[in-house]
């Protein structure tokens, strides 16, 4: 763009350097040349010579018109073609820009990411405005009623630290630009309502040589938070559709879960967990992919066996001691055999 | 109750340096969004940089690189180091809590005078 430019006169525009995307446009070039009286004055947009809709006002002053403007960003310069001279002389030279006014920040949420030591909100800023648009987060004390402002730009991290004060916060968005100015719904905040789990990972999965072999899925988590709700869902990795199993999960111990699935196919899973009662979830873990062994023998496939069944949802502990060359200490697994369902809405999908 | 008191301006050439001081109260500062604003003779109000919350800071077009925000949270004091001034930065400058846009930003002090003349 034209930063610093020395003018030999004067360049403005209607109805302003930053103007609404779509509306009409007047610029104007005036000559304060010495030495020269203009033959012509020309426009020149991003560069190029403009040919159409320039007026000549009068013997120092011309304007060119553009109906709708609608290009985010132009370069426009004017030059004075004098008499006697080969080159076009400088006028002066303006950064225009178009663009829309903010739409209200839309579908604001505060979590904590455990041990993370943040608060994040994020937001949908609406459709691109073009230009540049400051978004200020407001958060502000229930209980002090001082607040604090941060600037973002479609999101933001607040240190816990400065959350210290109270437990209890109003948040809101105000997005501000030249054109405009918007502020999205009020969110009301408890700190403690909206912590989410430390992130869960499936560590190993294994196939069973029983007669009807089942998969155990092994889990874990470091979150210190004692009721954590959780879903596992997995599928084919041919197929679209995710069957989930729903469960409370104790991360004291390693987490055991049981799955009885088609042989010989590979499977994807993936697990999410919540604090039991809240609203906020973790991002699905990453995919585990897991190839369960070849059916031995030949054995009528049972129906109930399929992931896709609905099963009866049930939690089962099992104890289980460790192999004769450790030190005998028992350690409780948790086990789960429970429904299946077709999952809907998820992101993260896999094949 | 909110208070801010600037201090610290006075004349100088042009290309000089300049450093305005903000002693604030009643209200916990170590956490608050603040803002410079100024006002030249004949003209409104203007802002020149703001700090937010968790220390981003933010300078108007005209004052970039040349002017420095920052906030001593011991001494409950907000700065403004003004470098390379120019004649056009004449004006009495105000400090005041919150950002400089979405009218969230108030001032209670008296401000302090600037004159950048040779």
């Known amino acids: 763009g034209i930063t610093s430019i020395n003018c030999s006169g004067d360049m403005w525009v209607e109805p302003g350097e930053i103007f609404q995307m779509g509306m009409n446009v007047s610029i104007y070039c005036q000559e304060a040349l010495k030495h020269c009286r203009p033959r012509n004055l020309y426009f020149y947009k991003n560069g190029f010579k403009e040919e159409f809709d320039i007026t000549r006002i009068n013997r120092t002053t011309a304007r060119i018109w553009y109906k709708g403007f609608s290009e985010p960003h132009a370069y426009m310069h004017c030059t004075a073609e004098c008499p006697g001279h080969f080159q076009e002389t400088l006028i002066c030279g303006k950064d225009i820009s178009s663009g829309h006014p903010p739409d209200a920040p839309s579908n604001l949420t505060c979590v904590i990411y455990e041990y993370s030591g943040n608060m994040t909100c994020t937001w949908n800023t609406g459709k691109p405005t073009y230009i540049d648009t400051k978004y200020i987060v407001h958060v502000k004390s229930l209980e002090t009623e001082e607040e604090q402002q941060y600037l973002a730009s479609s999101y933001v991290k607040i240190s816990t630290d400065s959350l210290q004060g109270s437990r209890k916060y109003l948040v809101w968005v105000q997005a501000v630009n030249s054109l405009g100015m918007e502020n999205s719904q009020q969110l009301h905040v408890h700190l403690d309502d909206i912590v989410i789990p430390s992130a869960s990972i499936i560590s190993r999965a294994e196939t069973t040589n029983d007669t009807v072999p089942k998969t155990i899925v092994y889990w874990k988590s470091k979150t210190m938070i004692e009721k954590v709700f959780c879903e596992m869902r997995y599928k084919t990795t041919t197929n679209q559709t995710w069957s989930v199993k729903e469960f409370d999960a104790n991360f004291t111990y390693v987490q055991q879960s049981e799955f009885y699935l088609e042989p010989d196919s590979k499977y994807v899973f993936q697990v999410r967990c919540q604090e039991t009662g809240k609203r906020n979830w973790q991002p699905w873990s990453s995919p585990f992919v897991h190839q369960t062994s070849q059916e031995t023998g030949k054995r009528n496939w049972q129906p109930w066996s399929s992931p896709f069944v609905h099963q009866t949802s049930q939690t089962v502990s099992q104890v289980t001691a460790k192999s004769s060359h450790e030190p005998q200490k028992m350690e409780m697994l948790s086990a789960t055999i429970f429904r299946g369902h077709p999952a809907s809405g998820n992101h993260q999908d896999i094949g | 109750q909110v208070q801010l008191q600037e201090s610290g301006g006075g004349l100088v050439q042009p290309g000089g340096s300049l450093r305005l001081s903000c002693a604030t109260s009643g209200f916990t500062f170590s956490s608050s969004a603040m803002t410079w604003v100024r006002q030249a003779p004949g003209k409104g109000l203007d802002w020149v940089s703001g700090i937010d919350s968790g220390g981003t800071t933010v300078y108007a077009d005209s004052v970039k690189g040349r002017f420095t925000i920052s906030k001593d949270n011991a001494k409950n004091t907000l700065y403004l180091q003004m470098n390379s001034l120019k004649t056009e930065d004449t004006a009495v400058y105000y400090c005041?809590?919150?950002?400089?846009?979405?009218?969230?930003?108030?001032?209670t002090g008296q401000g302090t005078q600037v004159t950048v003349s040779s």
């Open positions: 005041a809590t919150g950002l400089p846009w979405g009218n969230t930003w108030r001032t």
